[in-house]
Amino acid sequence: WELTILHTNDVHSRLEQTSEDSSKCVNASRCMGGVARLFTKVQQIRRAEPNVLLLDAGDQYQGTIWFTVYKGAEVAHFMNALRYDAMALGNHEFDNGVEGLIEPLLKEAKFPILSANIKAKGPLASQISGLYLPYKVLPVGDEVVGIVGYTSKETPFLSNPGTNLVFEDEITALQPEVDKLKTLNVNKIIALGHSGFEMDKLIAQKVRGVDVVVGGHSNTFLYTGNPPSKEVPAGKYPFIVTSDDGRKVPVVQAYAFGKYLGYLKIEFDERGNVISSHGNPILLNSSIPEDPSIKADINKWRIKLDNYSTQELGKTIVYLDGSSQSCRFRECNMGNLICDAMINNNLRHTDEMFWNHVSMCILNGGGIRSPIDERNNGTITWENLAAVLPFGGTFDLVQLKGSTLKKAFEHSVHRYGQSTGEFLQVGGIHVVYDLSRKPGDRVVKLDVLCTKCRVPSYDPLKMDEVYKVILPNFLANGGDGFQMIKDELLRHDSGDQDINVVSTYISKMKVIYPAVEGRIK
């Protein structure tokens, strides 16, 4: 019996088609993805093949103005329109708190939303009961398939799930649910979840009875053969893991941003064993037409976004200096504003010993593309912020050793004076450079804000200590020559859309007046 699994993950609000790098579509003939194009391909496969499931492995929320404005209603609407069969909760589904998940998505979705390792307690338990499930048994043709969900247990550090949701260890939580499915005579089981490729592989290895793992969170691109675009495969598709009980378990993920549709064909025997698995992600490029009815619906929903872009978010009473003449040479107040917003967006008081789990921010000066003039009545709009941060990136959480941070700050000024983009703006860091010294030895003082303290203060950076840092995904991926970050990072979790982080901060503060205050000397 053959099952076709179509899957997406980490779509992050890319409802409209995007450019090849998943930023805003400029030249339509070269654009990719989007729900209208996805629907065309899904329907094509549904018509051609008998047993098809369309699954999403989480993080539909967060990433473009679509989420900023519609707050998840757009996810429910368009996923319903595409007739998704199931979705796993990702960490970003909690970005607007539990209410921001329940009202727009859980109550509106016509498909099951799953996570076995999230347990509700207190008053939330009854409120959320039945709105998400640990597993769902789906009829497919003449067979049944069990889908069991899971979500990163790091979610409390990455998002805003509140205090009434407990995130358990994935493997510990999944095993009893899979065992329950087995007692219900469900012998074909897919683990669908959002904990990253390493955890996906562990689930395949450790959870008895899981036949296939469909994952997300790590934006992993897998491919067999010559890849069709710029993404470099992390392994073959599917990636085969040998389970502890000797089975070959296919593990898949489909990169991110709706650029690809994962396509996996699984052959099951009478006992529900996987006899064979093959496929590849399908690049959703312009050779696939956008479905006209979904496209028309997108255009209808788009109108509200254009209006939102010009509305006032807040005011500035000072010039926000985002000029390259400042931000690529010295501390600039636009850099300070953005870093302060980045830290503010990551306030999570999850431990009494820590005032916060992260205190540091770094930001490449070259990523700041425009100033904002306060003489326009001080008004700041989304449109203004889009000029400052035009690349559609995210502000991510990484864990780095002190020694890696030291290398990064040396790189920041290794060719100082040439107006290059790698000059770092900071938050929660005091750095002193001596530019008369030779490159690679210019950082003379590097103090960082403590986290395990009730009164935050600056202490010297320790080379062997592991620090959490918020930074642009561009830097996490080694951009602007920061190869040491990419090579040496110990953990990387993708965060919120850059403009959204700054806009939320400005809306919260109402009036801003960032200063140049001696963070960089």
Partner: antibody, heavy 113, light 106 residues
Framework: EVTLKESGPVLVKPTETLTLTCTVS????????IQWVRQPPGKLLEWLGV???????DYNAAFISRLTISKDTSKSQVVLTMTNMDPVDTATYYC???????WGQGTLVTVSS | DIQMTQSPSSLSASVGDRVTITCRAS??????LNWLQQKPGGAIKRLIY???SLDSGVPSRFSGSGSGTEYTLTISSLQPEDFATYYC????????FGGGTKVEIK
Amino acid sequence: EVTLKESGPVLVKPTETLTLTCTVSGFSLKSYGIQWVRQPPGKLLEWLGVIWSGGSADYNAAFISRLTISKDTSKSQVVLTMTNMDPVDTATYYCAGQYGSVWGQGTLVTVSS
Amino acid sequence: DIQMTQSPSSLSASVGDRVTITCRASQDIGDRLNWLQQKPGGAIKRLIYATSSLDSGVPSRFSGSGSGTEYTLTISSLQPEDFATYYCLQYAGSWTFGGGTKVEIK
């Protein structure tokens, strides 16, 4: 639990027709095929034929003229019919799942006058 | 038709021995190979499917490997209950079996 059980006569006279039934439980004949295999005493396993989930059948070329495999999906039963039986057809007859994950216990059919 | 050549046809071994049985296909069968165990009573049980995946309840001392036309069943440490006849079965085309390997007590 997934099981297969063969039933039918233990003794068949030469030139007669053998009819064996394989009763399936734990999976659907709409989704999976059934294979038939036989093993003469002390000899090797020999594939006879298969009926697929869609209802079509394939046969070992050596038996194509005298073998028919059919099914009644509603009863979860598959029937093997072999005409013109000969003493050399004496064997244990097995039905098995399409992928060989499950086997019947086998039924010994003796062809003798 | 795809032919399966299995060797050896029989072997004598002691408890604790490592046993290897091989099957060669007349053409590439792309991992579509099962290993079956038949006990003296006639009952047939699949041990390994898709070349190397272990069936539920089968001890981990059994393992399978191979690709293309060459396939191997290994019993890492022979146990008393393992004395039986083993067959390879290809299902890339119409089923064909290897000639069997009878594993006897030395």
